[in-house]
Amino acid sequence: FKVATPYSLYVCPEGQNVTLTCRLLGPVDKGHDVTFYKTWYRSSRGEVQTCSERRPIRNLTFQDLALAHGGAQAANTSHDLAQRHGLESASDAAGNFSITMRNLTLLDSGLYCCLVVEIRAAASEHRVHGAMELQVQTGKDAPSNCVVYPSSSQDSENITAA
């Protein structure tokens, strides 16, 4: 399986909300002994590998933001901890998973990574990740809503707040 990032760049005004999205692409094994662990974290475009280093998002670690469930199930974090930080991660049965960040500040700018681990009991872990950039802007040059740039082309889309 692979992870697709529909958008590689999100440019948002300060104070806006944004939902960063990743999509799990098949074939996805939904067997009894397969579990999926999904999470989010901040990182950097390192010399060795992008998304290798795992930094917190608003002081929440990737452990705090984790989702774990069988291949056919949906999951949602309703952690008070995450919501107190203006964050919510969610996943649906179609393979989409996301993190919503509320009331963006300039400090939220940076590289964000989604991580999916396919766990096969008594075998191994298969991990894949996706990366996307968030730029939070302020002042007269800031867009009125988030503008997202698709990973596959240079065309941009204007999206309303999450």
Partner: antibody, heavy 117, light 107 residues
């Protein structure tokens, strides 16, 4: 702050079953592997096995025929049973949180189990 | 089962010196390797994950490098509290295995 605490008898007779429990406090038992690792006196670390919060398990083949790990999410506990023990099973037994695609990031303080008649 | 071989078994150094610890895998583990520190009577403590990333709260004097089969843990300048046993651990497949450990002792 997640903390782990092992509990169980410190002395077990040969051929009997070693039983230990690990209590998870300060956080959720969901979304992680919960592992048992042991360390014989003066020796290195050996992974025994894990249970996922959903109940799926994975054991070290060297111990698989004798090991059972179970979880009670309502009590935030997971347990180890090791049957037919011998003196070679004398060790400090640790429970640990194991994050998928990461590492053992939180450990209990360990409990010494001696197998002797 | 992947076998991890650590060398040297014992490293005798003075505070302020540089420590270089090696871990070699019997087959490639990509960069899926962690390092732990263990002091007498204590549980191991995670230092490095994915070969070269420091865990939360670990001082910058600890660094990891390598990929494939050969890995190194470096302590740039030993502090008194760094004298301990260090273990590497792979997680590319199961069973998860640890190296035999390297003891860093005061010279």
């Amino acid at each position: 702050q997640v903390q782990l605490q092992e509990s169980g008898p410190g002395l077990v007779k040969p051929s009997e079953t070693l039983s230990l429990t690990c209590t998870v406090s300060g956080g959720s038992i969901s979304s992680y592997y919960w592992s048992w690792i042991r360390q014989p006196p003066g020796k290195g670390l050996e992974w025994i096995g894990y249970i996922y919060y959903s109940g799926s398990t994975n054991y070290n083949p060297s111990l698989k025929s004798r090991v059972t790990i179970s979880v009670d999410t309502s009590k935030s506990q997971f347990s180890l049973k090791l049957s037919s023990v011998t003196a070679a099973d004398t060790a400090v037994y640790y429970c640990a949180r194991d994050i998928p695609a990461f590492a053992f990031d939180i450990w209990g303080q360990g409990t010494m189990v001696i197998v002797s008649s | 089962e992947i076998v991890l071989t650590q060398s040297p078994a014992t490293l005798s150094l003075s505070p302020g010196e540089r420590a270089t610890l090696s871990c070699r895998a019997s087959q490639s583990v990509s960069y899926y390797l962690a390092w732990y520190q263990q002091k007498p009577g204590q549980a191991p403590r995670l230092l490095i994950y994915d070969a070269f990333n420091r865990a939360t709260g670990i001082p910058a004097r600890f660094s990891g490098s390598g990929s494939g089969t050969d890995f190194t843990l470096t302590i740039s300048s030993l502090e008194p509290e760094d004298f301990a046993v260090y273990y590497c651990q792979q997680r590319i497949n199961w069973p998860l295995t640890f190296g035999g450990g390297t003891k860093v002792e005061i010279k």
